[in-house]
C-alpha cells in the first residue's frame, strides 16, 4: 500500500501542487521502473481509477487533464502496467489542493476584556480559502516604535504584560497562504480605550402587584470601572422587535430596573455595557426569561430558569437556542 511512497518514477502537477480552485490542471506521471516498458499508465484520484482525459506523451510519461478542478483536496497516484507483472506497479503519489488566495483582512478589532489580562484581536478573514492560511498580527508601539509579531490561524490573545511600549499602538494583520498574501489597514488603539467591562448578568426578576403591576429586573457586574453605560433590551418571546432602555450605571450595588409590562406574557431580557464614551460593547448577556403574572406577585431567579409555570411563586425558563432574532454578541 501507499503508506510510505518509495517512488519508481515521478508525479508532478502543473501549474502547481496547490492551485487556484476552478483552474484547469495537468498531472504528469513518469515511470522509472527497472526492466519495465509500461504497457499502460493509470491515474487514481482518492483511490478511484481515472478513465478519461489521459494522454500518453511518450513511452514512460502520461498526462491526466482536469478541467475546472473544484475539489479542495485529492490524493493522486499513478501506476504502470508492466509486461510479466501480474499487479500494477506503483510509480508515485501526491496530495493536491485547490483554494483561493486570502482576502484583505478587514474589521480588525482589539479589545481587553476586564480581568482577562489579554488584548484579544479579531478580524474578518473574508471568503473561505480552503487551504492552510496563516495570519501574522503586527503590534507596533507608537511611543517606542518597537514592533511585535504574532502568528496564528484565527484570532490572537496577547498578554497585556507583553505590551510594554506605552498605551498607544498600531495593529495590522497580514494573511498569507500558498496562493497569495494580503495586508489589512492599520488600526490605531489606546489601551485605555478598548477595555470592555466585566460581564453584566441579570440575576432575578420580580413583579410587584401594585395598582399598575411593576416588574423589577435585578442585575449586576463585577466591574471596577466607575463610569459605565448599559443597555437592557426586552421583548415578549412572541415578538421580533426589541425594546431598549439605556442606563448610566454605578456598580457599587446591584442594579434595579423597573418595567411596566403586559400581564400573563413571557418576556426575555438581555443586558450589555460599555465604559462610558468608549467604542466597544460587551456581547449581550445570556437570555433571561420572566413571565408576568395574571394578578399574583411573582419572583424569577437566575437559579430557577427552567420551563415550569405554577400559580403563586412561579419560575421562568432559560434556553439560549430558542429565539430567531439577533442574539449575536456584537462588540462593535
Amino acid at each position: 500500500g501507499i503508506t510510505n511512497i518509495n517512488c519508481s518514477g515521478h508525479i508532478w502537477v502543473e501549474p502547481a501542487t496547490i492551485f487556484k480552485m476552478g483552474m484547469n490542471i495537468s498531472i504528469y506521471c513518469q515511470a522509472a521502473i527497472k526492466n519495465c516498458q509500461p504497457r499502460k499508465l493509470h491515474f487514481y484520484k482518492n483511490g478511484i481509477k481515472e478513465r478519461f482525459q489521459i494522454t500518453r506523451i511518450n513511452k514512460t510519461t502520461a498526462r491526466l487533464w482536469y478541467k475546472n478542478f473544484l475539489e479542495p483536496h485529492a490524493s493522486m497516484y499513478c501506476t504502470a502496467e508492466c509486461p510479466k507483472h501480474f499487479q500494477e506497479t506503483l510509480i508515485c503519489g501526491k496530495d493536491i489542493s485547490s483554494g483561493y488566495p486570502p482576502d484583505i483582512p478587514d474589521e480588525v478589532t482589539c479589545v481587553i476584556y476586564e480581568y482577562s489580562g489579554n488584548m484579544t484581536c479579531t478580524w474578518n478573514a473574508g471568503k473561505l480559502t480552503y487551504i492552510d492560511t496563516k495570519y501574522v498580527v503586527h503590534v507596533k508601539s507608537l511611543e517606542t516604535e518597537e514592533e511585535q509579531q504574532y502568528l496564528t490561524s484565527s484570532y490572537i490573545n496577547i498578554s497585556t504584560d507583553s505590551l510594554q511600549g506605552g498605551k498607544k499602538y498600531l495593529v495590522w494583520v497580514q494573511a498569507a497562504n500558498a496562493l497569495g498574501m494580503e495586508e489589512s489597514k492599520q488600526l490605531q488603539i489606546h489601551l485605555d480605550d478598548i477595555v470592555i467591562p466585566s460581564a453584566a448578568v441579570i440575576s432575578r426578576a420580580e413583579t410587584i402587584n401594585a395598582t399598575v403591576p411593576k416588574t423589577i429586573i435585578y442585575w449586576d457586574s463585577q466591574t471596577t470601572i466607575e463610569k459605565v453605560s448599559c443597555e437592557m433590551r426586552y421583548k415578549a418571546t412572541t415578538n421580533q422587535t426589541w425594546n431598549v432602555k439605556e442606563f448610566d450605571t454605578n456598580f457599587t450595588y446591584v442594579q434595579q430596573s423597573e418595567f411596566y409590562l403586559e400581564p400573563n406574557i413571557k418576556y426575555v431580557f438581555q443586558v450589555r455595557c460599555q465604559e462610558t464614551g468608549k467604542r466597544y460593547w460587551q456581547p449581550w448577556s445570556s437570555l433571561f426569561f420572566h413571565k408576568t403574572p395574571e394578578t399574583v406577585p411573582q419572583v424569577t431567579s437566575k437559579a430557577f430558569q427552567h420551563d415550569t409555570w405554577n400559580s403563586g411563586l412561579t419560575v421562568a425558563s432559560i434556553s439560549t437556542g430558542h429565539l430567531t432574532s439577533d442574539n449575536r454578541g456584537d462588540i462593535g
Epitope: G1, I2, T3, H42, Y44, N46, G47, I48, K49, E50, R51, F52, Y77, T79, Q87, E88, L90
Partner: nanobody
Amino acid sequence: EVQLVESGGGLVQPGGSLTLSCVASGRTFSTDVMGWFRQAPGKEREFVAAHRTSGISTVYAASVKGRFTISRDNAKNTVYLGMKSLKPEDTAVYVCAAGSDASGGYDYWGQGTQVTVSS
C-alpha cells in the same frame, strides 16, 4: 443500492488509538473501492484512505500516512480504519464511502462516526 454503517468512533487522548468499522450491505459486488473520508467542523470533506480490490490495494492521504491503516474483510463485507498516534487535528466526523472505477467516483456514503482527539 449499497448501505454503509460506520461504528467505533469516540473520544480518545492525543497519541491514542482507535479502530473504525464500516459494514456494507446490499449490492456490494458493485463496489471495487471502499474509502474513508473525514470532515472537521467548518472544513471541507477530505480523503483519508481507500482500499481497492484491484491494482494498488491501499492508498492514504499524506496527513495520515504511517499512522492510519485501512483493511478489508470481504467475508464480513467490512472495511476497517486503524488509527494510531492520533492528534487533535484528526478530530472530525469519519465517513465511509463505496465507489467504483466504472462510475468514476464514490457513489454511496455512510452517515459518519465522530472521532474526538482531546486531553
